[in-house]
Amino acid sequence: AILGRSETQECLFFNANWERDRTNQTGVEPCYGDKDKRRHCFATWKNISGSIEIVKQGCWLDDINCYDRTDCIEKKDSPEVYFCCCEGNMCNEKFSYFPEMEVTQPTSNPVTPKPP
């Protein structure tokens, strides 16, 4: 392990479409991948009229967009589906939305998901 880097071995798993996809609905997912590549966690969610609906959470393959991010934060302005990724075990338990382009203070607060 490289000093100061969070190795990701497992992530929070959630799948809103678990019946259709024939997976578990929630749990802990061990992250697999090529031994020399980095692994991350991700979260995806929708904001339906102010209500947060988690779509999926799980492991994410080596992605420079996720390097050295200990927190799962979506920075894209008003995406249709929110996505964030991070490094470190279970770092996707909490996720937030702080759009980069915002000049004013972000109105959204960090989200702690409560699976239905």
């Epitope: 090529d34 991700f42 999926k56 492991c59 994410w60 992605d63 420079i64 967009n65 995406p79 996505f83």
Partner: antibody, heavy 115, light 111 residues
Framework: QVQLVQSGAEVKKPGASVKVSCKAS????????INWVRQAPGQGLEWMGT????????SYAQKFQGRVTMTRDTSISTAYMELSRLRSDDTAVYYC????????WGQGTLVTVSS | QSALTQPASVSGSPGQSITISCTGT?????????VNWYQQHPGKAPKLMIY???KRESGVSNRFSGSKSGNTASLTISGLQAEDEADYYC???????????FGGGTKLTVL
């Protein structure tokens, strides 16, 4: 083992559209991106765009903006690339590749545009 | 994003070393460790050889190595073998906020 299997060769007329599929297996489809790359006969590789397989978010090369649409169906681990208003210079082999590093590639789909 | 610049061709004899360059700008190759190298044999799909400037892809021979100096990334192949004869492309990571771009390709001939 990781595999990306693409749909078969297509022959299209100028002005038509083509939709190429890329079925992934051997890994969790929703754990990365799918990139699309094309290669005209005797030419180099040309990046067309990418889709985040879990969120569906896309980024397209400026050259193809307005003409290309990338989608995916997570229930069958398949990504799609549709190119519209085809011209003869769109004749090429179209590849899908996994992840931001393009670490696994499909076998390629030859699209021939000819009147 | 403009294409990366590679020499059109290079050649070498078996056992020799060759280097293929890939020149970009300070905003792509120069500032990010996200250049990759691909090998493509005629009629086949490209194969990832080196990613993130210098990391060898799993299963790739240690005769292949990558490096970077300033705005130029390089692929070095030592102990050239006949099967190394192929086209080589440099390219960048693509996904999220990063847009992909490839070099024009370099044809390697093993004499």
């Amino acid at each position: 083992q990781v595999q990306l299997v693409q749909s078969g060769a297509e022959v299209k007329k100028p002005g038509a559209s083509v939709k190429v599929s890329c079925k992934a297996s051997g890994y969790t489809f929703t754990s990365s991106y799918i990139n699309w790359v094309r290669q005209a006969p005797g030419q180099g590789l040309e990046w067309m765009g990418t889709i985040n397989a879990v969120s569906g978010s896309t980024s397209y090369a400026q050259k193809f903006q307005g003409r290309v649409t990338m989608t995916r169906d997570t229930s069958i681990s398949t990504a799609y690339m549709e190119l519209s208003r085809l011209r003869s210079d769109d004749t090429a082999v179209y590849y899908c590749a996994r992840g931001g590093w393009f670490d696994y590639w499909g076998q390629g789909t030859l699209v021939t545009v000819s009147s | 994003q403009s294409a990366l610049t590679q020499p059109a061709s290079v050649s070498g004899s078996p056992g020799q070393s060759i280097t293929i360059s890939c020149t970009g700008t300070s905003s792509d190759v120069g500032s990010k460790n996200y250049v990759n190298w691909y090998q493509q044999h005629p009629g086949k799909a490209p194969k990832l050889m080196i990613y993130g400037v210098s990391k060898r892809e799993s299963g790739v021979s240690n005769r292949f190595s990558g490096s970077k100096s300033g705005n130029t990334a390089s692929l070095t192949i030592s102990g050239l073998q006949a099967e190394d004869e192929a086209d080589y492309y440099c390219g960048t990571f693509a996904g999220g906020k990063y847009y992909g771009v490839f070099g024009g390709g370099t044809k390697l001939t093993v004499l």
